[in-house]
């Protein structure tokens, strides 16, 4: 969390941002909140990106003002116009690109004053893994697949029964470049698995950490997976 304050000249207002990550090819949110104003027409929101000449987005007098918008953001940005009056200046970024990563500034001007806060935005690709029993293999084998990751992640297997065991000798992980030549499909195979055990396939890069669990018993197979974005800090 980053909390910024306005300085000199007129009164300062508190602006708060949260560091976040965007999944390339999908839509992302750059979070920013501020002390609300009574009149929408008195609120100006300006989003900037470090190193970029034009504005990322501007909202003033109750509507978007995109005359100074930078080429790289054209047609890809929107604020939540109906939520501005309650202090939400978050920006929706469509079709997140790898090059959208960087430091952003949420700059707010209201009748109470002005303020700004920076936000670190990481971009990459992350997806939920799915773990299945590989019935085609000669021995009991698990196959963990996740369709889109970038940068290249690490894959670690763990087991509930053999906690702390190192499975690197009995697993094999491959990365296959997807058609857009950026993201990769992750496939990891774990050999010699035993029944009545829960195995976890953990995929992690500097943006996200995802885990796929599978519990194999004689009567059933239970799966569970979850994904967590890393380093989401407020400012």
């Amino acid at each position: 969390l980053i909390i910024g304050f306005g300085i000199s000249g007129r009164h300062s207002i508190t602006v708060t941002t949260v560091a976040s990550a965007g999944n390339i090819g999908e839509d992302g949110i750059l979070s920013c909140t501020f002390e609300p104003d009574i009149k929408l027409s008195d609120i100006v929101i300006q989003w900037l990106k470090e190193g970029v000449l034009g504005l990322v987005h501007e909202f003033k007098e109750g509507k978007d003002e995109l005359s100074e918008q930078d080429e790289m953001f054209r047609g890809r940005t929107a604020v939540f116009a109906d939520q501005v009056i309650v202090g939400n200046a978050s920006l929706r970024l469509k079709n997140v690109q790898l090059t959208d990563a960087g430091t952003y500034k949420c700059y707010i001007i209201t009748s109470k004053g002005k303020g700004n806060a920076n936000l670190e935005y990481k971009t990459g690709a992350f997806s939920m893994p799915e773990v299945n029993v590989d019935y085609n293999a000669s021995s009991e084998t698990l196959r963990c697949e996740a369709p889109r990751w970038f940068p290249q992640p690490t894959v670690v297997w763990a087991s509930q029964v053999d906690q702390g065991a190192n499975f690197s000798e009995v697993s094999n992980t491959s990365f296959e470049l997807n058609s857009e030549n950026v993201t990769m499909k992750v496939v990891s195979v774990l050999y010699n698995v035993t029944i009545n055990n829960t195995y976890s396939c953990m995929i992690e890069n500097d943006i996200a950490k995802a885990t796929g669990d599978i519990k194999v018993t004689e009567s059933e197979i239970k799966r569970r997976s979850h994904l967590q974005l890393l380093n989401s800090k407020a400012s």
Epitope: G6, I7, E50, E68, E71, T99, G102
Partner: antibody, heavy 118, light 107 residues
């Protein structure tokens, strides 16, 4: 550490051409707009030209429009200024600088002197 | 093009003095103004951007204020290393014009 190093300056006759280079290091060059700013001997700063991170947008001062061309090679982390039809009034120290927020400039290179004289 | 006019063009002051430099834009530039310091034979250094935001590493005795067309750079207590030339620059629209500079000299 962010560094910008200009080169290519020197003595050139009026009507001649020169190409300045600015080698960048210590940051993701393609993410930053870049600029050329000049300073004639004993005078103030004059913004000359700017270019977006991708190279897709270029900007010029009226005094150099049609004569100077700004470009960049992101694979080489290098900014260029091609200067044609040079005039005596183009004599100056030329600085390259990185866009910080909007067109505020930080850091700057150490500068390279261009002397247009017969 | 937006014209930037600085005043005074030069001033003499003593260590410890409070110094104020003004910059006027020929049209509304909102808060998009930067201030630079330049010492003889050196490249300029960014002090303030967005009219009032101090660049990282710049001493807090420097401050900026203003919006629209009128802006001020203030040095609250002048130090020996502050004797230099100061420039304003509008950063909202190409061409990104500079003021003509203010030279701060030792009295």
């Amino acid at each position: 550490e962010v560094q910008l190093l200009e080169s290519g300056g020197g003595l050139v006759q009026p009507g001649g051409s020169l190409r300045l280079s600015c080698a960048a290091s210590g940051f993701t060059f393609s993410s930053y707009g870049m600029h050329w700013v000049r300073q004639a001997p004993g005078k103030g700063l004059e913004w000359v030209s700017g270019i977006s991170g991708s190279g897709g947008s270029t900007y010029y001062a009226d005094s150099v429009k049609g004569r100077f061309t700004i470009s960049r090679d992101n694979s080489k982390n290098t900014l260029y200024l091609q200067m044609n039809s040079l005039r005596a009034e183009d004599t100056a120290v030329y600085y390259c600088a990185r866009t910080q927020w909007r067109a505020s400039l930080d850091p700057w290179g150490q500068g390279t002197l261009v002397n247009v004289s017969s | 093009d937006i014209q930037m006019t600085q005043s005074p063009s030069s001033l003499s002051a003593s260590v410890g003095d409070r110094v104020t430099i003004t910059c006027r834009a020929s049209q509304d530039i909102s808060y998009w103004l930067a201030w630079y310091q330049q010492k003889p034979g050196k490249a300029p250094k960014l002090l303030i951007y967005g009219a009032s935001t101090l660049q990282s590493g710049v001493p807090s005795r420097f401050s900026g204020s203003g919006s629209g067309t009128d802006f001020t750079l203030t040095i609250s207590s002048l130090q020996p290393e502050d004797f230099a030339t100061y420039y304003c620059q509008q950063t909202t629209m190409s061409p990104y014009t500079f003021g003509q500079g203010t030279k701060v000299e030792i009295k």
